[in-house]
C-alpha cells in the first residue's frame, strides 16, 4: 500500500537538488580562494539536516544554524547591495562591479539561489512532488525560513552606505511584504549603517518621472528615518546605459544622468 503523502500547493524540490548544492559549493570554493577552507560535504550535510525528517511547515531559524556557522563569510560591510523584485539586474551589476555583493554573491545565497526544497516529517526522503507555498500553505517552510535567516544576517552585517535596487515598474516599488521590506530593512543596524541609498530602476524607455517621489518610496524613507538611518534615492532612467557605464566609466556619454 503506497504511503499517503502530503500534497502541497507549491512546486516540489528542484530535481537533482543534492547534486546541485554540492556542485555549486565546489564551484564557489574554486572561484573564491578565501573560502577554500570550506568542506562542501559538511555544508551539504548541514543543509540537509535543516529540513530532512522535519515537518516542512515547522522549520525554524535554529534548524539552519549549523549551516549558517559553516557558511560564515566576511564580505566588505560597506559594499552591500540589497535588491527587491529586480534580482537579474542586481546580479548583472555585481558581476561587473566586482567589489560589491548581493546576498547571492555569498556562499549560502549562491547555493540556494532559484532552488526549492523540502522534506517530510519522520522520513529521510526529499519531497520532489510538492513543497509548501508561503501564502497557500505556511510561512515556516524550508525555503522561506532559509531566505529569512540569511537575509537577516546579511542585513545585520551591513555598514556605512547600503544600496538597494528597486523595481520602478512594479505597482509597489517598495513592498513591505518583500524580503527586503519585511526582513532586511528592519535588520540594518543604525549604529553601523549611516545611509540607505535606493536606486529605482525605470522600465520604460521614455519614463522620465521622478519615481523617488512614489508613495511607497516615501513610506520606505519614513521607516528608515524612524530607525535613525539617513535615506537617499536615485532614479536609474536607463538601466542598460547604467550597466554600460559601470563597465566603462570613462565613456563620454556617462557623465550625463543615467
Amino acid at each position: 500500500v503506497p504511503r499517503w503523502r502530503q500534497q502541497w500547493s507549491g512546486p516540489g524540490t528542484t530535481k537533482r537538488f543534492p547534486e546541485t548544492v554540492l556542485a555549486r559549493c565546489v564551484k564557489y570554493t574554486e572561484i573564491h580562494p578565501e573560502m577554500r577552507h570550506v568542506d562542501c560535504q559538511s555544508v551539504w550535510d548541514a543543509f540537509k539536516g535543516a529540513f530532512i525528517s522535519k515537518h516542512p511547515c515547522n522549520i525554524t531559524e535554529e534548524d539552519y544554524q549549523p549551516l549558517m556557522k559553516l557558511g560564515t563569510q566576511t564580505v566588505p560591510c560597506n559594499k552591500i547591495l540589497l535588491w527587491s523584485r529586480i534580482k537579474d539586474l542586481a546580479h548583472q551589476f555585481t558581476q561587473v562591479q566586482r567589489d560589491m555583493f548581493t546576498l547571492e554573491d555569498t556562499l549560502l545565497g549562491y547555493l540556494a539561489d532559484d532552488l526549492t526544497w523540502c522534506g517530510e516529517f519522520n522520513t529521510s526522503k526529499i519531497n520532489y512532488q510538492s513543497c509548501p507555498d508561503w501564502r497557500k500553505d505556511c510561512s515556516n517552510n524550508p525555503v522561506s525560513v532559509f531566505w529569512k535567516t540569511v537575509s537577516r544576517r546579511f542585513a545585520e552585517a551591513a555598514c556605512d552606505v547600503v544600496h538597494v535596487m528597486l523595481n520602478g515598474s512594479r505597482s509597489k516599488i517598495f513592498d513591505k511584504n518583500s524580503t527586503f521590506g519585511s526582513v532586511e530593512v528592519h535588520n540594518l543596524q543604525p549604529e553601523k549603517v549611516q545611509t540607505l541609498e535606493a536606486w529605482v530602476i525605470h522600465g520604460g524607455r521614455e519614463d522620465s518621472r521622478d519615481l523617488c517621489q512614489d508613495p511607497t518610496i516615501k513610506e520606505l524613507e519614513s521607516i528608515i528615518s524612524k530607525r535613525n538611518i539617513q535615506f537617499s534615492c536615485k532614479n536609474i532612467y536607463r538601466p542598460d546605459k547604467f550597466l554600460q557605464c559601470v563597465k566603462n566609466p570613462e565613456d563620454s556619454s556617462c557623465t550625463s544622468e543615467i
Partner: antibody
C-alpha cells in the same frame, strides 16, 4: 565518468625542462582544482602543488617553488605541469589528480601517470 | 611539514584474514573547519593511486565495505576485514589539512 588522461613518457637531459599534460573529461573542468603528485621509482608519493582552472591561481610546495609552473587551457580542459632545471632525482612518475568534491586540498580521481626519465 | 609515519612497511596476510595498517602524523590533523583530513589510498601494482577512505572513516564511492578507517588525534588505522587477492598493493595514508599535503611511506600488502 571522470577521466584524467596524461601525456606519454619523456626522456630528458639534466638541466632541461619537461611539460606534462593532463586532459580531463566527464566533469566540469573549471570547477575542480588539479593537483600534481610525483612518485620516484620504488618510492612514495610527493605532492607538488595545485592549480585552480577557474582563475589559474596556484599553490606550490616550497620544495618546487621556482622550478615548477602549473597552467591550464580551459578550451581543451587540459592542465599542464612544467618542471625546469631537471636533475637525475627528478626521475619519477608524475600524476595529476582532481580535487575531491568535498574539500579543495583533497584528491579523488588520478591520471594514469607520466614517466619522466632524466638521464645524461 | 607534517610527517606521516606508516607501519608496518610490509604486511604479508592470508586470504580471508584481517589486516591492519597504522598511520601516525607528526601533528594534529584537525582543520580549522573542524574536519580531520586523513585519507587512505590504494595503489595496485602498475596502477595509479585510488582513493579508498577520506576524512578518517568515510568510504569513497565504489569502495567495498571490507575497508574501514578509524582513529583520532595522531593515531589512525586502516582495516581490511577479510583480505582478497585484489587487495594486493601499496597503501598510503595522506593528510590534506596542512599545506604541503604529505603522504606516509606506504605499506605493501602481499599474500602469504
Amino acid at each position: 565518468q571522470v577521466q584524467l588522461v596524461q601525456s606519454g613518457a619523456e626522456v630528458k637531459k639534466p638541466g632541461a625542462s619537461v611539460k606534462v599534460s593532463c586532459k580531463a573529461s566527464g566533469y566540469s573542468f573549471t570547477n575542480y582544482a588539479v593537483h600534481w603528485v610525483r612518485q620516484a621509482p620504488g618510492q612514495g608519493l610527493e605532492w607538488m602543488g595545485v592549480i585552480s582552472p577557474y582563475y589559474g591561481d596556484t599553490t606550490y610546495a616550497q620544495k618546487f617553488q621556482g622550478r615548477v609552473t602549473m597552467t591550464v587551457d580551459k578550451s581543451s580542459s587540459t592542465a599542464y605541469m612544467e618542471l625546469s632545471r631537471l636533475r637525475s632525482d627528478d626521475t619519477a612518475v608524475y600524476y595529476c589528480a582532481r580535487r575531491f568534491e568535498g574539500f579543495y586540498y583533497s584528491m579523488d580521481y588520478w591520471g594514469q601517470g607520466t614517466l619522466v626519465t632524466v638521464s645524461s | 611539514d607534517v610527517v606521516m609515519t606508516q607501519s608496518p612497511l610490509s604486511l604479508p596476510v592470508t586470504l580471508g584474514q584481517p589486516a591492519s595498517i597504522s598511520c601516525r602524523p607528526s601533528q594534529s590533523l584537525v582543520h580549522s573547519n573542524g574536519n580531520t583530513y586523513l585519507n587512505w589510498y590504494q595503489q595496485r601494482p602498475g596502477q595509479s593511486p585510488k582513493l579508498l577512505i577520506y576524512k578518517v572513516s568515510k568510504r569513497f564511492s565504489g569502495v567495498p565495505d571490507r575497508f574501514s578507517g578509524s582513529g583520532s588525534g595522531t593515531d589512525f588505522t586502516l582495516k581490511i576485514s577479510r583480505v582478497e587477492a585484489e587487495d594486493v598493493g601499496v597503501y598510503y595514508c595522506s593528510q590534506s589539512t596542512h599545506v604541503p599535503l604529505t603522504f606516509g611511506g606506504g605499506t605493501k600488502v602481499e599474500i602469504k
